[in-house]
Interface confidence: low
């Protein structure tokens, strides 16, 4: 079951999967000036059997200027175009991907691939967040999000991560600095959003893991 939407956006943070659950699709995207070969796959698919998992299909790019190939490029479905992208980067946490049954490792790069990879995650996928350079994490702890299925709907749990600039104070977004009483919570805490305002968006956040917010990671 593919996840309906993308992992939560955390300001000043990026996410990365350490391993990919079977069923995950990776778009075969090529960098500017290149395109998929005429009979090339639209995506790679993580598949597996009882012993191991691997990526089916291979992405292949060719120069758009090549004359002996068709110029028509199969357009990507709109939904796929809108999926979240993850920058290619080294894993944020040391995880032995091979030790996770039912998961594929990060696919090796292919020639002339795009700078960003577009994944289509499945239920049960976990991604890890980290603050981008120049920002630091408040509330250290599990900064992960899991795609969960509830009542026929999929949703991502909210990672326990707030990234703030070095010069900012350690406060929640939208929270004002306490004026008088250092022990009291600013009054705006309960009123500044008027009619709005985790359960781990944990809302929690992994079912049996004590990781993060109310909606599914209450632990």
């Amino acid at each position: 079951e593919l996840c309906d939407d993308d992992p939560p956006e955390i300001p000043h943070a990026t996410f990365k999967a350490m391993a990919y659950k079977e069923g995950t699709m990776l778009n075969c995207e090529c960098k500017r000036g290149f395109r998929r070969i005429k009979s090339g796959s639209l995506y790679m698919l993580c598949t597996g059997n009882s012993s191991h998992s691997s990526w089916d299909n291979q992405c292949q790019c060719t120069s758009s200027a090549t004359r002996n190939t068709t110029k028509q490029v199969t357009p990507q479905p709109e939904e796929q175009k809108e999926r979240k992208t993850t920058e290619m980067q080294s894993p944020m946490q040391p995880v032995d991907q091979a030790s996770l049954p039912g998961h594929c490792r990060e696919p090796p790069p292919w020639e002339n691939e795009a700078t960003e990879r577009i994944y289509h995650f499945v239920v049960g996928q976990m991604v890890y967040y980290q603050c981008v350079q120049g920002y630091r994490a408040l509330h250290r702890g599990p900064a992960e999000s899991v795609c969960k299925m509830t009542h026929g709907k999929t949703r991502w749990t909210q990672p326990q991560l707030i990234c703030t600039g070095e010069m900012e104070t350690s406060q929640f977004p939208g929270e004002e600095k306490p004026q008088a009483s250092p022990e009291g919570r600013p009054e705006s805490e309960t009123s500044c959003l008027v009619t709005t305002t985790d359960f781990q968006i944990q809302t929690e956040m992994a079912a049996t893991m004590e990781t993060s917010i109310f909606t599914t990671e209450y632990q």
């Epitope: 944990q202 809302t203 004590e210 632990q219």
Partner: antibody, heavy 103, light 109 residues
């Protein structure tokens, strides 16, 4: 009784699409009761079993507003309805909207 | 019927310490984080403790939370009159795929 009500909840001061929003209600003199959750980013929802089929949660990203519509109202639906943002627990709550169901 | 069980009331004198219990099951407290909320009369609930024992900024150190197995507790030391409020525990429930609250404990100081 039998009618529907749509409660709105406008967010400000943070990135609306980055955090889930929950709806919790509280009947007079009673405790808190979770109704459901909506992801403002994609619009996906998850409702408490008790309200399945009667509640619909939506959002309007252009106005950073989430909505909770409850149909087939009964007298026992009389309560204060809160929306609450989800980060490290329900850290920001709306002031609540009192919905009274009477004939 | 609340998903978590709390004593309906608790009473203690100023300056003393009080503990409020919250009992659940393996599908909620046993496998998920516990949260505590304080609701002063006529106001919206306020997050007091998150992830079992963490305090949001602005919450006094007099408030502490703990969890063991399928139970959790909130302790308030150096009680003050302004601590008079209703206290709720909450957790995600894997079986229900939703948040469950305790019935609430009315604290009288």
């Amino acid at each position: 009784p039998g009618a529907s009500v749509k409660v709105s909840c406008k967010a400000s001061g943070y990135t609306f699409t980055s955090y889930y929003m929950h709806w919790v209600r509280q009947a007079p003199g009673q405790g808190l009761e979770w109704m459901g959750i909506i992801n403002p980013s994609g619009g996906s929802t998850s409702y408490a079993q008790k309200f399945q089929g009667r509640v619909t949660m939506t959002r309007d990203t252009s106005t950073s507003t989430v909505y909770m519509e409850l149909s087939s109202l009964r007298s026992e639906d009389t309560a204060v309805y809160y929306c609450a943002r989800d980060i490290l627990g329900l850290d920001y709550w709306g002031q609540g909207t009192l919905v009274t169901v009477s004939s | 019927q609340p998903g978590l069980t709390q004593p309906p009331s608790a009473s203690e004198t100023p300056g003393q310490r009080v503990t409020i219990s919250c009992s659940g099951s393996s599908s909620n407290i046993g496998s998920n984080y516990v949260y505590w909320y304080q609701q002063l009369p006529g106001t919206a609930p306020k997050l007091l403790i998150y992830r079992n024992n963490q305090r949001p900024s602005g919450v006094p150190g007099r408030f502490s939370g703990s969890k063991s197995g399928t139970s959790a507790s909130l302790a308030i030391s150096g009680l003050r009159s302004e601590d008079e409020a209703d206290y709720y525990c909450a957790a995600w429930d894997d079986s229900l795929s939703g948040v469950v609250f305790g019935g609430g404990t009315k604290l009288t100081v």
